[in-house]
Interface confidence: low
């Protein structure tokens, strides 16, 4: 007898989410079941069900299949968390590109590529067919969307509504072509579900048919999500485990994008002279092993046969001969010219926090005087007497001119976040060095958080027109687009500026991304008057371990009745414990789950302590952070929130508090949110705005 | 906001090639939610519609200028270009980029204009 | 091709007067799935681009004075000034963005009496 194939990995997979159907029409079927998978292969067979299935959710608490004829991204249904729920959506209704000759392809494009419109399945005008939805049961014949149900060479087609074309093809992209990776891959974090002998990928989630260490709970950062390609351990590129049971794992064709440079979050910082770390960002030229042997060329082969190629590694400059850390090593290594000894580590090489002497700073480092004179991003400090002048424009004082010396890193502005300095570059004119806090050094503290002494609202007040406030609407909420889809909240605090979160930028290449303001509906529609489309020109990145990002727009925003800024709070401030407070966001919308209408959730602020011992203790906050409940239970922000603000009111003032990161859970019962607290970066903000040069309208 | 501006040679002689470049300003012509097309208009005459790109890549013209045209992009320039082969005095008009909101699921109108350039074929 | 034939050609209005210009499709640009007609109008003054009036037939582009509306479905529409303003002297487009090549109609000129 035939073994039963096993369908799970046909699915993606949300953790801790179900799906609510609004709409009281909707069907749906359940039974009690041992595994998910049983309910994968009763929804891929369809068996015993009286629809198709696009979705279902297995419930772990009650061992229960919930099998849907709809989706997230289906009208009518919203996604919602639940511990004991893990929705699973057939890929095929959600991809948006096409494997092979998109046979499987169940997508809702319906325009050809000429730009015709596709003419109904079940409609014989303008053209007479017998491709009828009854005939080819399975083929999903729906609507007028574009399918390809006999596998025909061309892929998905359609009949058209202009009666001169009887059919033609649909421009849907090949999935290997739309996705691209950077480097090596170890950042990609795309789809792709199969390898480029065209084998299924086996779910990371799962042991069988071959057992293996990556598992998702132990590497959460290395993005294994379903079964798709990634590559966690420093190969040339992505690769995955396999179905078939004579192949453990193969490559994935993944094509490499045309910006082929690493990701801002990848970079390890570069250093010349000296070792950061385990030397991964190490682009010296040091090229003999510990004890004098010279290193044999990356690019040759002789005498040691090898795939560290600069071909295979391509981000890592592996130049020459030199000592390099390609592969995550404990330091930088190289094979060496002796044919008796394969490889030898460089640790000849001096540790950089040895080198540069005074290499951590205590308070927020004012009294630095080390001699570091590169930023974080790897850019060389230019001279302290070049810069004097920018430095004046935003310091009220003197400063002292003896501690300037050279170009060495230091903090005559009394910036809370650390030792900085002026870069020379006109994009980055200044960023902070990579130096830490001494250890044992506490972190100064700006003020007792639950105990309110600065005010956050400054003195203005609202400019009232015939006793209504102005803007009263939410004209300062930005959605971040992130490929044509919404991504990330935002919130427009200039007109050139908006905060947000540094977890919304999986691509470097600015041009993958635009900001959306004026919007209440977060979905692409054409009657939206209101709307401005701004793309993106920089990403400034907050100080360490903020989350924060400004992100600069390409031209200002017009301010008018749809488009307007939020305030910030004054530097430093607290504000009173069970002020009301509110989050918005457009929610989670990789998959355009819902109406699309901006959201709002009313919370309440609660002091840092009280918020720990909610946490159960586990959670310990510190002055970067602010918390604040829910007064409904469960409502709070979660994925696709990300970047938008925590706004309060403070004298008749609103503010953005807060910025909703990742980390803390979505909405859960009893859990106060943890959000960034703006007021600790307010001056950072302002020392942005003011020193990086804002474009023209 | 978004502007258009076309240039290129006012003259072109009989079957010559008609070159014409349109630069974006104000936005991305990289940005998936617009067409960019070029349309022509006869001395005294009506609109044509030339053809149109997509920034993936896409493109159309109008079959009545049979394989004449071609339509091309620069994204670092922020530029997208019109090439006419073999003109004649017919093609004599004042060509115009224009840009519609299509997006990727269907098409729009032409929002935004640019002011135009005339273009005589003479020998 | 879909052509696009306006009426009537020219047209001489008073001021404050109403002004009706009619476009007809050789086939329906109407699509039943979003129940939307892709059918647009243009303003053209001399010397000027043409102006985005009216969209989907019926929706007005942001900016544009109440005084025109955009009416029909199908293959038969109209574009009505309803108090014909001096600055309202042009000559006026439909356009048919249902099927490409997209087409626009011959055009009607709108003078004052």
């Known amino acids: 007898q035939r073994k039963r194939r096993n369908t799970i990995h046909e699915f993606k997979k949300s953790a801790k989410t179900t799906l609510i159907k609004i709409d009281p029409a909707l069907k749906i079927k359940t039974k009690k079941v041992n595994t998910a998978d049983q309910c994968a292969n009763r929804c891929t067979r369809n068996k015993g069900l009286p629809f198709t299935c696009k979705a279902f959710v297995f419930d772990k608490a009650r061992k229960q299949c919930l099998w849907f004829p709809f989706n997230s991204m289906s009208s009518g249904v919203k996604k919602e968390f639940g511990h004991e729920f893990d929705l699973y959506e057939n890929k095929d209704y959600i991809r948006n590109c096409i494997i092979g000759k998109g046979r499987s392809y169940k997508g809702t494009v319906s325009i050809t590529k000429s730009g015709i419109k596709c003419q109904p399945w079940s409609s014989m005008i303008p053209h007479e067919h017998s491709f009828l939805p009854s005939s080819y049961r399975g083929k999903d014949l729906q609507e007028n969307y574009c399918r390809n149900p006999r596998g025909e060479e061309g892929g998905p087609w359609c009949f058209t509504s202009n009666p001169e074309v009887r059919y033609e093809v649909c421009d849907i992209p090949q999935c290997s072509e739309v996705e691209c990776m950077t480097c090596n891959g170890e950042s990609y974090r795309g789809l792709m579900d199969h390898t480029e002998s065209g084998k299924i990928c086996q779910r990371w989630d799962h042991q069988t048919p071959h057992r293996h260490k990556f598992l998702p709970e132990r590497y959460p950062d290395k993005g294994f999500d379903d079964n798709y390609c990634r590559n966690p351990d420093g190969q040339p590129r992505p690769w995955c485990y396999t179905l078939d049971p004579h192949t453990r794992w193969e490559y994935c064709a993944i094509k490499t994008c045309a910006d082929n440079t690493m990701n801002d979050t990848d970079v390890p910082l570069e250093t010349t002279e000296c070792i950061q770390g385990q030397g991964e960002g190490y682009r010296g030229t040091v090229n003999t092993i510990w004890n004098g042997i010279p290193c044999q060329r990356w690019d040759s082969q002789y005498p040691h046969e090898h795939d560290m190629t600069p071909e295979n590694f391509k981000c890592k400059d592996l130049r020459e001969n030199y000592c390099r850390n390609p592969d995550g090593s404990e330091s930088p290594w190289c094979f060496t010219t002796d044919p008796n000894i394969r490889v030898g580590y460089c640790s000849q090489i001096p540790n950089c926090d040895m080198s540069h002497g005074q290499d951590c700073y205590r308070g927020n480092g004012k009294n630095y005087m080390g001699n570091l004179s590169q930023t974080r991003s790897g850019l060389t400090c230019s001279m302290w007497d070049k810069n004097m002048e920018d430095l004046h424009r935003h310091i009220f004082w003197e400063p002292d001119a003896s501690k300037l010396n050279e170009n060495y890193c230091r903090n005559p502005d009394d910036d809370a976040h650390g030792p900085w300095c002026y870069t020379g570059n006109p994009l980055i004119p200044w960023d902070y060095c990579p130096i830490s806090r001494c250890e044992g050094d506490t972190t100064p503290t700006i003020v007792n958080l639950d105990h309110p002494v600065i005010s956050c609202a400054k003195t203005k007040q609202l400019r009232v027109v015939n006793g209504i406030p102005t803007r009263t609407n939410i004209g300062w909420m930005v959605s971040l687009r992130y490929r044509n889809k919404h991504i990330c909240g935002g919130s427009l605090i200039k007109e050139s500026w908006v905060l947000t979160a540094r977890q919304c930028f999986p691509s470097r290449d600015l041009k993958d991304y635009e900001a959306w303001l004026g919007i209440h509906d977060v979905h692409e529609r054409g009657d939206e008057k209101c709307k401005q489309v701004l793309n993106v020109s920089q990403l400034v990145y907050g100080p360490e371990g903020s989350d924060l990002v400004l992100m600069k727009l390409a031209r200002p925003a017009v301010l008018d009745d749809f488009v307007s800024t939020i305030d910030l709070p004054n530097y430093g401030c607290t504000i009173p414990e069970k002020t009301s407070c509110s989050v918005y966001g457009w929610g989670y919308t990789g998959l355009i789950n819902y109406d699309g209408l901006l959201r709002v959730a009313h919370l309440y602020i609660m002091g840092n302590e009280k918020c720990s011992q909610h946490h159960r203790g586990k959670v310990t906050l510190n002055e970067s952070e602010i918390c604040a409940g829910a007064e409904k239970i469960g409502s709070g922000p979660c994925e696709g929130d990300y970047g938008g603000p925590l706004v309060c009111e403070q004298h008749k003032m609103r503010m953005v508090l807060g910025v909703i990161v990742p980390g803390r859970g979505c909405a859960i019962p009893n859990r106060p949110g943890i959000f960034v607290r703006v007021a600790y970066y307010a001056k950072w903000i302002h020392k942005i705005i003011l020193t990086y040069k804002v474009p023209q309208s | 906001q978004v502007q258009l501006k076309e240039s290129g040679p006012g003259l072109v002689k009989p079957s010559q090639t008609l070159s014409l470049t349109c630069t974006v300003s104000g936005g991305s012509i990289s940005s998936g939610v617009y067409y960019w097309s070029w349309i022509r208009q006869h001395p005294g005459k009506g609109l044509e519609w030339i053809g149109y790109?997509?920034?993936?890549?896409?493109?159309y013209h109008n079959p009545s200028l049979k394989s004449r045209v071609t339509i091309s992009v620069d994204t670092s320039k922020n530029q997208f270009s019109l090439k006419l082969s073999s003109v004649t005095a017919a093609d004599t008009a004042v060509y115009y980029c224009?840009?519609?909101?299509?997006?990727?699921?269907?098409?729009?109108?032409?929002?935004?204009w640019g002011q135009g350039t005339m273009v005589t074929v003479s020998s | 091709d879909i052509v696009m034939t306006q009426s009537p050609d020219s047209l001489a209005v008073s001021l404050g007067e109403r002004a009706t210009i009619n476009c007809k499709s050789s086939q329906s640009v109407l699509f039943s799935s979003n129940n939307k007609n892709y059918l647009a109008w243009y303003q053209q003054k001399p010397g000027q681009p043409p102006k985005l009036l009216i969209y989907w037939a019926s929706t007005r582009e942001s900016g544009v004075p109440d005084r025109f509306s955009g009416s029909g479905s199908g293959t038969d529409f109209t574009l009505t000034i309803s108090s014909l303003q001096a600055e309202d002297v042009a000559v006026y487009y439909c356009?048919?963005?249902?099927?490409?090549?997209?087409?626009f109609g011959q055009g009607t000129k709108v003078e004052i009496k």
């Open positions: 224009a840009r519609d909101r299509s997006g990727y699921d269907h098409p729009d109108a032409f929002d935004i």
């Open positions: 356009q048919q963005y249902f099927s490409p090549p997209w087409t």
């Open positions: 790109f997509y920034y993936s890549g896409n493109t």
